[in-house]
């Protein structure tokens, strides 16, 4: 089989027939050096998954539940292409599983015990697997058989397709539990009717159900959604209030050597020639000899799944939690109000050492998880492998786009009421050597630049955002002759000045000596013309405050700031000569961990925060010899956010807009992946 062949896996005679037709029609429209199709027939989807893992086939399209199976070891498959529905302008690749209730009913998600429930059908995604999976650990023991536990949890249900003889309570609201439209409460519309008629208190359906059944907004306003954080929201706010976000139908391939680019090339060309309304002879999204053969008949096209996205990220934390609970059936010993330990994400070796020290001192309240880059840490928090970390504003933006929330802000100024007063921010500045007297904001082209890291506020988003407004393109590596911007592509001129050795060169962590505020300033001292840092960086590393050999003899007076009006000022005049005021670094977590992270961190800072006077003999949370490990070293306390508890509110609309404008220059694979889940 030639290398440019995609071996498609079919699960029935009818699918195999359509696959052969697909193969033949593609041959007729694609040049001989283009991608081609071969067909492999297997008895089931699970057999297809195994065949792909064993390199006997390359691709198959799966529902969400099977994407989860495909991801599990030893299969290790990943999503590569998603079907979309709706229009090309507003493509829908996901649906949202929601819990709908009547507006005046007054209970929350954690008060469902004893209520009456309406389900689309036993074993169905939005109507059963997701809600029951998420409620699994609240079900009364024994939890097997599951139907019995569910029957004992709710006071009555309609779960079409359930066994009404063994579990009569599951059919209490719809006598007989019929498994077809003959049962008026079957399926999405049926489950909603069960709620509407007053038979049930809650209906587990998908987000579109209520819109399909109630055309009138006034009627829809009589209903609300239950959110996982035990609040309610209007039905049109399903993107912020759902049980899970579920991919509709997805092509999977091997994670390693999986031909994902070839599969996309094939399907992209296929949709051009044989997509919706393209061809009479062969239609990709039509099944004359059956239903949903190879692809869903209702699909309108394909979208490439971003390469950074593995199955866990694609399926989402809530969905994976629900399915894992149902499959594995494991729960904590007994549900308690106690917070579990917070798993802190530490960046590379240096942060891990400090985190381990914190963990020991916290007596089990803090555990440590490692990752090599900030984005890897954010991904681990998203999928539950980690719980929290403190981030620069630029990464608070990415984390926010990925569904995480800020919980506490670092404060840098001593005040009586530190923990209750989040600060407005710190200043992003451009520092130069006083001796380079001709250098101004207006003649930086061709100079050597030093950045904290790509994607960070003072070191990248602010200066590059301002620069983009001037030069109107993203080729920053051409604007500066060379530089060090950790996180850039290794062959970029913006890695040329970096000092890390071997694989650590230009890495966005402390293994790169020019990483972070102190690193970027060191880069200026040793090699560069301009450093983009925070206003405290120069005083913190001069006048003997940093004992490292490169810094111990530095004098603040030897450096100046570049102002946006083309003038220069002494370092202490940052308030009148800065590029922007940046939002303070903030701790982020998943919404479900918000309360516990908040509680434990407030306890931890009372034990190990700025009130500790001697850091030589005691653990200090906010100290690491100018290396800013886990937190910035100038942190005085972690402050409550009050109502600024979403990433947009925390960062402010101008910063969000500024970073949004820079998105066209973004190299963030994680941001691309998260934007795919929530455009």
């Amino acid at each position: 089989v030639p290398d440019k062949t995609v071996r498609w896996c079919a699960v029935s005679e009818h699918e195999a027939t359509k696959c052969q037709s697909f193969r033949d029609h593609m041959k007729s429209v694609i040049p001989s050096d283009g991608p081609s199709v071969a067909c492999v027939k297997k008895a089931s989807y699970l057999d297809c998954i195994r065949a792909i893992a064993a390199n006997e086939a390359d691709a198959v399209t799966l529902d969400a539940g099977l994407v989860y199976d495909a991801y599990l070891a030893p299969n290790n498959l990943k999503p590569v292409v998603a079907e979309f529905y709706g229009s090309k302008e507003d493509p829908q690749t996901f649906y949202y599983a929601v819990a709908v209730v009547k507006k005046d009913s007054g209970f929350q998600m954690n008060q469902l015990r004893g209520k009456k429930s309406c389900h689309t059908g036993l074993g169905r995604s939005a109507g059963w697997n997701i809600p029951i999976g998420l409620l699994y650990c609240d079900l009364p023991e024994p939890r097997k058989p599951l139907e019995k536990a569910v029957a004992n949890f709710f006071s009555g249900s309609c779960a079409p397709c359930a066994d009404g003889t063994d579990f009569p309570q599951l059919c209490q609201l719809c006598p007989g539990c019929g498994c077809s439209t003959l049962n008026q409460y079957f399926g999405y519309s049926g489950a909603f009717k069960c709620l509407k008629d007053g038979a049930g208190d809650v209906a587990f359906v998908k987000h579109s159900t209520i819109f399909e059944n109630l055309a009138n907004k006034a009627d829809r306003d009589q209903y609300e959604l239950l959110c996982l954080d035990n609040t309610r929201k209007p039905v049109d706010e399903y993107k912020d209030c759902h049980l899970a976000q579920v991919p509709s139908h997805t092509v999977v391939a091997r994670s390693m050597g999986g031909k994902e680019d070839l599969i996309w090339e094939l399907l992209n060309q296929a949709q051009e020639h044989f997509g919706k309304d393209k061809s009479k002879e062969f239609q990709l999204f039509s099944s004359p000899h059956g239903k949903d053969l190879l692809f869903k008949d209702s699909a309108h096209g394909f979208l490439k799944v971003p390469p950074r996205m593995d199955a866990k990220m694609y399926l989402g934390y809530e969905y994976v939690t629900a399915i894992r609970n149902l499959r594995e059936g494991t729960c904590p010993e007994a549900p308690t109000d106690e917070c579990k330990p917070v798993k802190w994400c530490a960046l590379s070796h240096h942060e891990r050492l400090k985190c381990d020290e914190w963990s020991v001192n916290s007596v089990g309240k803090i555990e440590c998880v490692s990752a090599e880059t900030t984005e890897d840490c954010i991904a681990k928090i998203m999928n539950g492998e980690a719980d929290a970390m403190s981030l620069d504003g630029g990464f608070v933006y990415i984390a926010g786009k990925c569904g995480l929330v800020p919980v506490l802000a670092e404060n840098y100024n001593k005040s009586d009421n530190c923990e209750d007063t989040p600060e407005a921010g710190y200043f992003a500045i451009a520092v130069v050597k006083k001796s380079a007297s001709d250098l101004t904001w207006d003649n930086l082209k061709g100079k050597k630049s030093c950045h904290t890291a790509v994607g960070r506020t003072a070191g990248w988003n602010i200066p590059m955002g301002l620069l983009y407004n001037k030069i109107n393109h993203c080729r920053f590596d051409e604007f500066f002759s060379e530089g060090c911007a950790p996180g850039s592509k290794k062959d970029s001129s913006l890695c040329k000045l970096c000092m890390g050795s071997g694989l650590n060169l230009c890495e966005p962590n402390n293994k790169e000596g020019y990483y972070g505020y102190t690193g970027a300033f060191r880069c200026l001292v040793e090699k560069g013309d301009v450093a983009f840092v925070k206003h405290q960086t120069v005083p913190q590393n001069t006048g003997g405050k940093n004992p490292d050999p490169w810094a111990k003899n530095l004098n603040e007076k030897d450096y100046e700031l570049l102002c946006l009006d083309g003038t220069r000022k002494p370092v202490e005049e940052y308030a009148n000569c800065h590029l922007a005021r940046a939002p303070n670094h903030a701790v982020v977590t998943r919404k479900d961990k918000e309360a516990c992270v908040h509680k434990i961190l407030r306890q931890q800072q009372h034990l190990f925060g700025s009130n500790v006077t001697d850091c030589s003999g005691n653990f200090c949370l906010f100290r690491s010899e100018t290396k800013d490990l886990l937190f910035r070293d100038d942190t005085v306390c972690l402050a409550k956010l009050h109502d600024r508890n979403t990433y947009e509110k925390y960062l402010g609309e101008e910063y969000v807009k500024a970073v949004g404008n820079l998105r066209k220059c973004s190299t963030s694979s994680l941001l691309e992946a998260c934007t795919f889940r929530r455009p």
Partner: nanobody, 125 residues
Framework: DVQLVESGGGSVQAGGSLRLSCAAS????????MGWFRQAPGKEREGVAT????????YYADSVKGRFSISQDNAKNTVYLQMNTLKPEDTAMYYC?????FGCGSLAKSLFGYWGQGTLVTVSS
């Protein structure tokens, strides 16, 4: 949310004076720069003057230096533009602008994220 509301515009003879006010409401404690811009019919919007609310330091376009003065009343969340010795070429719609992100020291309108609706100033000869 941030709102900026201008007032004080009107018609005046050349050589006369006007005082414009800009009242800010919403999350205003964190402004890094506030300023006044103007737009004459058929022309680009241009910067007139800015003030740093934290330090009180001011910045003026060359065309208004010595004639216009920007000031603030932090207690009232208000910024003023005192315009003296007005000329016919000062006729324009005057806009109050603010940013919580960028510094003063530049009259580039792209740095300002919040804008008022404007107040009209007409100077006749």
């Amino acid at each position: 949310d941030v709102q900026l509301v201008e007032s004080g515009g009107g018609s005046v003879q050349a050589g006369g004076s006007l005082r414009l006010s800009c009242a800010a409401s919403g999350y205003t404690r964190s402004f890094t720069c506030m300023g006044w811009f103007r737009q004459a019919p058929g022309k680009e919007r241009e910067g007139v003057a800015t003030i740093n609310p934290g330090t009180g330091s001011t910045y003026y376009a060359d065309s208004v230096k010595g004639r216009f003065s920007i000031s603030q009343d932090n207690a009232k969340n208000t910024v003023y533009l005192q315009m003296n010795t007005l000329k016919p070429e000062d006729t324009a719609m005057y806009y109050c602008a603010a940013t919580q992100l960028f510094g003063c020291g530049s009259l580039a309108k792209s740095l300002f994220g919040y804008w008022g609706q404007g107040t009209l100033v007409t100077v006749s000869s």
